[in-house]
Interface confidence: low
């Protein structure tokens, strides 16, 4: 039962994270939550950083600044792959959730 519950938590988290990405950065509250997660967990996007390319409000060569290894204003523009966290947040935060939920 515990595994089923954890899988459900992961699935819900994945869906919710992707939904919040769609609202970035139009919704300031959403943006600050996602930015905090990405910066704290050193991750970028849901599955990986390329997820941001699919978001209408983000240009093809941009990720949120919170994806950067060294976060500064504008660091996510025309980014260098070596300078950002490439791992997705669902897996990374999911691992933390599995241990703690």
């Amino acid at each position: 039962a515990g595994y089923v519950f954890r899988d459900k938590v992961m699935s819900e988290f994945n869906n919710n994270f992707r939904q919040q990405m769609e609202n970035y950065p139009k919704n300031n509250h959403t943006a600050s939550i996602l930015d905090r997660m990405q910066a704290d967990f050193k991750c970028c996007g849901a599955a990986n950083y390329t997820d941001w390319e699919k978001i209408p409000s983000m240009s093809k060569n941009r990720v949120p600044d919170s994806c950067c290894i060294n976060v500064t204003v504008g660091c996510g523009i025309n980014f260098n792959e070596k300078a950002i966290h490439k791992e997705g947040c669902v897996e990374k935060i999911g691992g933390w959730l599995r241990k703690n939920v």
Epitope: V73, G74, N78
Partner: antibody, heavy 119, light 112 residues
Framework: EVQLQQSGPELVKPGASVKMSCKAS????????MHWVRQTPGQGLEWIGY????????KYNEKFKGKATLTSDKSSSTAYMELSSLTSEDSAVYYC????????????WGQGTSVTVSA | NIMVTQSPSSLAVSAGEKVTMSCKSS????????????LAWYQQKPGQSPKLLIY???TRVSGVPDRFTGSGSGTDFTLTISRVQAEDLAVYYC????????FGSGTKLEIK
């Protein structure tokens, strides 16, 4: 209010180079892409390239590679474009255009710099 | 490069009339993964710089009067001005930003 103030008109001789400036105000200079676009009666509007002032990353239209060089100075919030080996075909109005990265149509246009190439 | 073709090249209408202008791209500018058309419309009044009116093919920029409407998807787009006013005298350009950046040659709107 976003403003892009471009340098004045230039009259230059064929074969010479020219460097024009675009001073930005009213927004965080490093968080926008700065495009350069030229307008001629014959060719209409043509995208030259853009620079991301945060990291000085550039992207050029193939047609203008070797012709245009884009740079920026973060300390003065100013973007520059240098054009080399000028010919009469380079006579045009050149615009700098700030592109808000939330959608990347071209949002804020400078007033334009007129360049006339004549012997 | 994606080519952008506008028609007509010019048109003259009386104030209060409805006007439509067309923009066609040589290939689709619809990004299927999020159903957005990478197409914008600009207005350039005589002696002025171009001004962004519409992006994502149909989203009006804040402050642009609602008589300006962008529509279309894929390769065929239209800018409609529902009740033309004297101040709308300008050249209107469409612009694709799906693959690099290219502009149409413009439609000149004159007021009779």
């Amino acid at each position: 209010e976003v403003q892009l103030q471009q340098s004045g008109p230039e009259l230059v001789k064929p074969g010479a180079s020219v460097k024009m400036s675009c001073k930005a105000s009213g927004y965080t200079f490093t968080s926008y892409v700065m495009h350069w676009v030229r307008q001629t009666p014959g060719q209409g509007l043509e995208w030259i390239g853009y620079i991301t002032p945060y990291n000085d990353g550039t992207k050029y239209n193939e047609k203008f590679k070797g012709k245009a060089t884009l740079t920026s100075d973060k300390s003065s919030s100013t973007a520059y474009m240098e054009l080399s080996s000028l010919t009469s075909e380079d006579s045009a109005v050149y615009y700098c255009v700030g592109g808000d990265n939330y959608y990347y149509a071209m949002d804020y246009w400078g007033q334009g710099t007129s360049v006339t190439v004549s012997a | 490069n994606i080519m952008v073709t506008q028609s007509p090249s010019s048109l003259a209408v009386s104030a209060g009339e409805k006007v439509t202008m067309s923009c066609k791209s040589s290939q689709s500018v619809l990004y299927s993964s999020h159903q957005k058309n990478y197409l914008a419309w600009y207005q350039q009044k005589p002696g002025q710089s171009p001004k962004l009116l519409i992006y994502w093919a149909s989203t009006r920029v804040s402050g642009v009067p609602d008589r300006f409407t962008g529509s279309g998807s894929g390769t065929d787009f239209t800018l409609t001005i529902s009740r033309v006013q004297a101040e709308d005298l300008a050249v209107y350009y469409c612009h694709q930003y799906f693959s690099s950046f290219t502009f149409g040659s413009g439609t000149k709107l004159e007021i009779k």
